[in-house]
Interface confidence: low
């Protein structure tokens, strides 16, 4: 293909003063074949603390698509299939590494960023505070 | 920390032929202040599908430390505090992006890698296969 048009504001790959940079090969070694969480398991539906998956898209970030879990209920599903509010559905969060284009729109320059994402939900016993 | 010994075979940061590379600024923008999952919540203990967190360390990877969840039981904890084997504790997995030193020990050269990690556990209704 042709050369990527260069943003005049993009830092030079050869600039030794560009702060704390490394070269990263973008040919991703992917140990996992299935990247769509909706296909990888149906736990989000079968859990006692079920969740929905929301698509978060940002073209200036890699990965550009992140799936965020949102718990369906405040309580948990009991054996009868009803919501039991004596228990709580809570999101399990994971800190992940993403690449953020910096400056924006530069094809060859990124900054590492850590973001917190909700991966799924679990059912927990609530912390009850007794008032004297 | 000490300087990583340089592999004589490391590609040159200025090598324009180094395949499909970008510059990545390692000054991480971290939106989260708490990086230790054991401190961030006690859900792993309070969940009806509790889990233990195992430290996975690899100096050739960034992040070098990843916490892996392992469900404590096959079943889930019921209201009496006993394990109910009519339900299943299962790991919630997340695909994350890491940087792998390539070639090994190079201080300024990485390859993107995707790995699957278990973030926590959730309690699900088992799939029962009825034999005719």
């Amino acid at each position: 293909g042709i050369t990527i048009p260069r943003n005049p504001g993009c830092p030079n790959s050869e600039d030794k003063n560009f702060p704390r940079t490394v070269m990263v090969n973008l040919n991703i070694h992917n140990r996992n074949t299935n990247t769509n969480p909706k296909r990888s398991s149906d736990y989000y539906n079968r859990s006692t603390s079920p969740w929905n998956l929301h698509r978060n898209e940002d073209p200036e970030r890699y990965p550009s698509v992140i799936w965020e879990a949102k718990c369906r209920h405040l309580g948990c599903i009991n054996a009868d299939g009803n919501v039991d509010y004596h228990m709580n559905s809570v999101p399990i969060q994971q800190e992940i590494l993403v690449l953020r284009r910096e400056p924006p729109h530069c094809p060859n320059s990124f900054r590492l960023e850590k973001i917190l994402v909700s991966v799924g939900c679990t059912c927990v016993t609530p912390i009850v505070h007794h008032v004297a | 920390g000490i300087t990583i010994p340089r592999n004589p075979g490391c590609p040159n940061s200025e090598d324009k032929n180094f395949p499909r590379t970008v510059m990545v600024n390692l000054n991480i923008h971290n939106r989260n202040t708490n990086t230790n999952p054991k401190r961030s919540s006690d859900y792993y203990n309070r969940s009806t599908s509790p889990w233990n967190l195992h430290r996975n360390e690899d100096p050739e990877r960034y992040p070098s430390v990843i916490w892996e969840a392992k469900c404590r039981h096959l079943g889930c904890i019921n209201a009496d505090g006993n394990v109910d084997y009519h339900m299943n504790s299962v790991p919630i997995q997340q695909e994350i992006l890491v940087l792998r030193r390539e070639p090994p020990h190079c201080p300024n050269s990485f390859r993107l890698e995707k790995i699957l990690v278990s973030v926590g556990c959730t309690c699900v209704t088992p799939i029962v296969h009825h034999v005719a």
């Epitope: 073209p59 890699y62 | 499909r20």
Partner: nanobody, 119 residues
Framework: QVQLVESGGGLVQPGGSLRLSCAAS????????MYWVRQAPGKGLEWVAK????????YYVDSVKGRFTISRDNAKKSLYLQMNSLRAEDTAVYYC????????????WGQGTLVTVSS
């Protein structure tokens, strides 16, 4: 040999319309998300629109929302960009791109088609 060939650019007055086309060959077109990207004179690269491989979802940069429409015809291996209510700031070279490893880090680019919005 992957090829992306854009067409449909030209000179148009503010408020006018243009339809850009991109003919793809050399790869399984229906397996990839496709993008329109532009570069205004003396400016940086700007992502404009993205369409999923099956055409089920579209994404637009804020500045073109409601005015531009990305579409595709997998049978014809073609990508389109319908541009309405064009403004002077839409003047740029428009590139069709095939996304693969990194969105916005494209494996292959077309040669681009120049869109000039001027009275």
């Amino acid at each position: 040999q992957v090829q992306l060939v854009e067409s449909g650019g030209g000179l148009v007055q503010p408020g006018g319309s243009l339809r850009l086309s991109c003919a793809a060959s050399g790869f399984t077109f229906s397996s990839y998300g496709m993008y329109w990207v532009r570069q205004a004179p003396g400016k940086g690269l700007e992502w404009v629109a993205k369409i999923e491989q099956d055409g089920s979802e579209e994404y637009y940069v804020d500045s073109v929302k409601g005015r531009f429409t990305i579409s595709r015809d997998n049978a014809k291996k073609s990508l389109y960009l319908q541009m309405n209510s064009l403004r002077a700031e839409d003047t740029a070279v428009y590139y069709c791109a095939k996304g693969e490893i990194l969105p916005l880090y494209f494996d292959y680019w077309g040669q681009g088609t120049l869109v000039t919005v001027s009275s």
